[in-house]
């Protein structure tokens, strides 16, 4: 039994880091493998993560962490029984993938303006809370070419757009994702999408 693709990990910078790897053949990850992780610190003790299958030869493990700070560094040991398959390390602050925003809502009753709001996925005491920026994706269900991205570079989790920038009388969907420049994070996953019917009054033409 060998590791074909070494573990790579990302942290949500709150409580979970996710590590993925591939074995050289079909593996029952949860019964055959264990990922041990330990904070590099005087008083830390090793924790065991039981991996799950992620495709035939792929494994994924969710490492629980009670806290994350920029100084943290973890050692990782991948075991198959008594055999050490791989040894590595992981610094959560250098591999951050933010949590996805939630509660995306489209408010359509604001005088021909669409107001999209969503929730910051972090509590106020988390460092990322005040450092997230967002991308909002809006697309038409009827026209695949009608697909647009709005970059929200301010901190407020909301976006206002004129309803007239979209076609009237058809249905649209929106979703949002987040990233944080301060830790050069990857983008989060997209939030669940929300759907609305876009309709607005066409302005009368003046002659």
């Amino acid at each position: 039994m060998k590791v074909l693709q070494e573990p790579t990990c990302v942290s949500d910078y709150m409580s979970i880091s996710t590590c993925e790897w591939k074995m050289n053949g079909p593996t029952n990850c949860s019964t055959e493998l264990r990922l041990l992780y330990q904070l590099v610190f005087l008083l830390s003790e090793a924790h065991t993560c039981i991996p799950e299958n992620n495709g035939g030869a792929g494994c994924v493990c969710h490492l629980l962490m009670d806290d994350v700070v920029s100084a943290d560094n973890y050692t990782l040991d991948l075991w198959a029984g008594q055999q050490l398959l791989w040894k590595g390390s992981f610094k959560p602050s250098e591999h951050v993938k933010p949590r996805a925003p939630g509660n995306l809502t489209v408010h359509t009753n604001v005088s021909d303006t669409l107001l999209l709001t969503w929730s910051n996925p972090y509590p106020p005491d988390n460092y990322l809370y005040n450092h997230l920026t967002y991308a909002v994706n809006i697309w038409s269900e009827n026209d695949p070419a009608d697909f647009r991205i709005y970059n929200v570079t301010y901190l407020e989790p909301s976006l206002r757009i004129a309803a007239s920038t979209l076609k009237s009388g058809i249905s649209y969907r929106a979703r949002v994702r987040a990233w944080a420049q301060c830790y050069n994070t990857t983008w989060s996953e997209w939030s669940p999408s929300t759907k609305w019917h876009n309709s607005y009054r066409e302005p009368f033409e003046q002659h």
Epitope: F41, L43, E45, D72
Partner: antibody, heavy 117, light 107 residues
Framework: EVQLLESGGGLVQPGGSLRLSCAAS????????MSWVRQAPGKGLEWVSV????????YYADSVKGRFTISRDNSKNTLYLQMNSLRAEDTAVYYC??????????WGQGTLVTVSS | DIQMTQSPSSVSASVGDRVTITCRAS??????FAWYQQKPGKAPKLLIY???SLLSGVPSRFSGSGSGTDFTLTISSLQPEDFATYYC?????????FGPGTKVDFK
């Protein structure tokens, strides 16, 4: 809500012994290292001892090494400090404290130990 | 043992002042470093851990910085409840050690 409640302090003669206890609640006790920190009257803070979450590792300040023993009972959510061969300079308020990356994020109210003849 | 020195030992300040307290370690201690506030007759309260991480519930006017041997606690705008004694502490190696304290009192 995290709570730490020390007990067992009091007046003891030089050379005597005391056992301090710290009852913990509001968190997963066995997941965290715990420390004892003391403060002599009118003085600063002095770290005394620490024990890992499992109880497998213990460390002591040089001033108490060989005289004090830290222990824990994770089934009872309780931390202990057995103090032997007490000296006048051990007189202090003793605090138990929960570890957070080597710092102490929750403290008990303290228990006073007075060593005097 | 790692020795911690704090300066100043006391500072007189007014509400609204910016107050800076420094702590120097006798050898490099990475980022395992903390700041505490203590008021008379009370247990210390953790403000900053891992050198710069603000503990949940601590006002944002408190901030910590530094690494290696030199660390700083800054109170951006002193409030009436901030008059107290402040201690630094290293957790890079045993024995853990505290600084002697800095008393912040009314000018």
């Amino acid at each position: 809500e995290v709570q730490l409640l020390e007990s067992g302090g009091g007046l003891v003669q030089p050379g005597g012994s005391l056992r301090l206890s710290c009852a913990a609640s509001g968190f997963t006790f066995s997941s965290y290292a715990m420390s004892w920190v003391r403060q002599a009257p009118g003085k600063g803070l002095e770290w005394v001892s620490v024990i890992s979450g499992s109880g497998g590792s213990t460390y002591y300040a040089d001033s108490v090494k060989g005289r004090f023993t830290i222990s824990r009972d994770n089934s009872k959510n309780t931390l202990y400090l057995q103090m032997n061969s007490l000296r006048a300079e051990d007189t202090a308020v003793y605090y138990c404290a929960k570890d957070r990356r080597g710092s102490f994020d929750y403290w008990g109210q303290g228990t006073l130990v007075t060593v005097s003849s | 043992d790692i020795q911690m020195t704090q300066s100043p030992s006391s500072v007189s300040a007014s509400v609204g002042d910016r107050v800076t307290i420094t702590c120097r370690a006798s050898q490099g201690i990475s980022s395992w470093f903390a700041w505490y506030q203590q008021k008379p007759g009370k247990a210390p309260k953790l403000l900053i851990y891992a050198a710069s991480s603000l503990l949940s519930g601590v006002p944002s006017r408190f901030s910590g910085s530094g690494s290696g041997t030199d660390f700083t606690l800054t109170i951006s705008s002193l409030q009436p409840e901030d008059f107290a004694t402040y201690y630094c502490q290293q957790a890079n190696s045993f024995p853990f050690t505290f600084g002697p304290g800095t008393k912040v009192d009314f000018k």
